[in-house]
């Protein structure tokens, strides 16, 4: 379907033509369930929430509504040479029994993620192959997509930037010196943080950093960097904050776990990354976000998820977590407590927790 956002003069600033498929994991009384559905043909642009961006202040956004209160939002940003969907967000209403039968919660959920949708200014983004955007418990796949923002004349430009998946892979040629865009999955590392009162963090997980940055040639790239078991780990134990620091000579990654005393839940609340990127226009890369709520479980229990999880830290950084089991604040006998599995893993014998 074609979606369009126009400015006050009636000129389109965003045009998007794609079909979308949603895969959503949610809880039912009888355990976790996965629903897959397509963006319906009657999906419409929410005109009063979509925008061409306010002069000098904000970037354009496309908000698409369908069903009973579900919205898919694409937030765009640009620099001198490129534009991108810096953030895709999906709001879904679990009380919609048509899409989410027997959902144990009736709440409205919001998930979001950075994307790889980017193109040269004055060219359209084109991706015939599926473009997948992973969010917490949701995967959105765009098929046969033509998208352009910062438009000039209400029509797609002649030129196009093709997505990686559409480009033919070279059969020969010298190996690239730069890290691959999607490297092999990271290796599982074991972490243990001990304070005066014993162990306050026990974790087994494979971590990957997805970093979007501007290279010296002014091209924007998204690269994945695996955290190695050989990296040095350290940390600290506090009453309300437990930190895990994993570092090597090029980077320092700090994970901060917080606790909600009233609900007795621990969760990943902060991520801080300092890293050197030799081929970046600004080689020193620093990002932090202290308002996260991921990897959440009851204090005394452990959070476990075998499925890959993408934690959106900022538009430049996403933390990908594989095969995670983590327990913070209260750890008895240096062993994981009862398991609270993520919804995606779908083993209904265990207690499941929203996050």
């Amino acid at each position: 379907a074609m979606f369009m956002v126009k400015n006050g003069n009636g000129t389109a600033c965003i045009m998007a033509n794609f079909s979308a498929a949603f895969s959503v994991n949610y809880d039912t009384k009888s355990g976790p369930k996965n629903m897959t559905f397509d963006l319906p043909s009657d999906a419409t642009v929410v005109l009063n929430r979509s925008s061409c961006g306010k002069e000098n202040t904000s970037d354009p956004s496309l908000v698409i509504a369908f069903g009973r209160g579900h919205t898919l939002t694409l937030n765009f940003t640009r620099n001198a040479t490129r534009y991108s969907v810096q953030l895709m967000s999906f709001v879904y209403n679990l009380s919609d029994t048509h899409l989410f039968p027997n959902a144990s919660s009736k709440e409205i959920k919001t998930v979001e993620s950075i994307t790889d949708i980017r193109a040269d200014i004055d060219k359209k983004y084109r991706c015939v192959s599926g473009t997948q955007v992973h969010m917490n418990n949701v995967t959105v796949t765009l098929h046969d997509a033509t998208i352009q923002a910062y438009l000039s004349n209400s029509s797609f430009s002649r030129g196009e930037t093709r997505c990686e998946q559409d480009r033919p892979s070279p059969t020969t040629g010298p190996p690239s010196p730069s890290p691959p865009l999607v490297p092999t999955n990271p290796t599982v590392s074991k972490y243990n943080v001990t304070g005066n009162n014993g162990t306050c963090l026990l974790a087994s997980m494979a971590l990957q950093l997805n970093i979007t940055y501007l290279k010296k040639d002014n091209k924007t790239v998204t690269r994945a960097f695996n955290i190695s078991p050989n990296d040095t780990s350290s940390g600290s134990c506090g009453i309300n904050l437990v930190t895990l620091k994993v570092e090597n000579k090029n980077r320092a990654l700090e994970l901060q776990f917080g606790m909600n005393a009233s609900s007795s839940l621990f969760f990943l609340q902060g991520v801080r990354l300092n890293m050197t990127l030799p081929d970046a226009l600004v080689p020193t890369f620093s990002i932090s976000n202290h308002s996260l709520k991921a990897l959440q479980a009851t204090v005394g229990n452990s959070y476990k998820c075998n499925t890959e999880e993408h934690i959106f830290v900022s538009k430049m950084l996403s933390l990908n977590v594989f095969s995670v089991q983590v327990q913070a604040f209260k750890v008895d006998s240096d062993r994981f407590g009862s398991v609270e599995e993520c919804v995606q893993d779908g083993n209904s014998m265990h207690h499941h927790h929203h996050h």
Partner: antibody, heavy 118, light 106 residues
Framework: QVQLQQSGAELVKPGASVKMSCKAS????????IHWVKKSPGQGLEWIGA????????PYSQKFKDKATLTADKSSSTTYMQLSRLTSEDSAVYYC???????????WGQGTLVSVSA | DIQMTQSPPSLSASLGGKVTITCKAS??????MAWYQDKPGKGPRLLIH???TLQPGIPSRFSGSGSGRDYSFSISNLEPEDIATYYC????????FGGGTKLEIK
């Protein structure tokens, strides 16, 4: 209509720096890149760099990345170019230019003449 | 940066005649090519964009063609006011001018 008004001619000594301005009017300043182009008898037209006033992002030509610094002031819709460590090779007319979307460089300022002389 | 090789550096032609200038890019520029006329004491003037699209007000004596890495620009029925230096510009990946061609009338 679109107008780009550049600052006046400059006579500067070798080794010094110069900062010239380009005031834009007749359109939304943050919607378009402003480019800077050098015109000299020896080298013809050369693209120096561009700046996107929305966020200050500024790609440069490899040749000028250590010579030129581009900045923009959204409040006055003005773009600036500073040239450092000037030599006689930098004597030229410098133009600020705006593209018309994908129609290349359509709008040109009147140019700023820089003369480097001891 | 993409390099643009423009030739010839200078040429001389008769009034009423035709001239052709070529530009070769160091890589495929997907027809993102423009041509400019530059006269002493005046700012450059855009004649053609997108390889072959004439700007409003530019006479049809001017024309452009090409694809991939190779592009050409022609002026037919030369007139005295065509005396100028002509430049190509690629704007597919950043922006690069060619070295210029100085046109003189015999």
């Amino acid at each position: 209509q679109v107008q780009l008004q550049q600052s006046g001619a400059e006579l500067v000594k070798p080794g010094a720096s110069v900062k010239m301005s380009c005031k834009a009017s007749g359109y939304i300043f943050t919607n378009y890149n402003i480019h800077w182009v050098k015109k000299s008898p020896g080298q013809g037209l050369e693209w120096i760099g561009a700046i996107y006033p929305g966020n200050g992002d500024a790609p440069y030509s490899q040749k000028f990345k250590d010579k030129a610094t581009l900045t923009a002031d959204k409040s006055s819709s003005t773009t600036y170019m500073q040239l450092s460590r000037l030599t006689s090779e930098d004597s030229a007319v410098y133009y600020c230019v705006r593209a018309n979307w994908d129609v290349a460089f359509a709008y040109w300022g009147q140019g700023t003449l820089v003369s480097v002389s001891a | 940066d993409i390099q643009m090789t423009q030739s010839p550096p200078s040429l001389s032609a008769s009034l009423g005649g035709k001239v052709t200038i070529t530009c070769k890019a160091s890589q495929d520029i997907d027809r993102y090519m423009a041509w400019y006329q530059d006269k002493p004491g005046k700012g450059p003037r855009l004649l053609i964009h997108d390889t072959s699209t004439l700007q409003p007000g530019i006479p049809s004596r001017f024309s452009g063609s090409g694809s991939g890495r190779d592009y050409s620009f022609s002026i037919s029925n030369l007139e005295p006011e065509d005396i100028a230096t002509y430049y190509c510009l690629q704007y597919d990946n950043l922006w690069t001018f060619g070295g210029g061609t100085k046109l003189e009338i015999k």
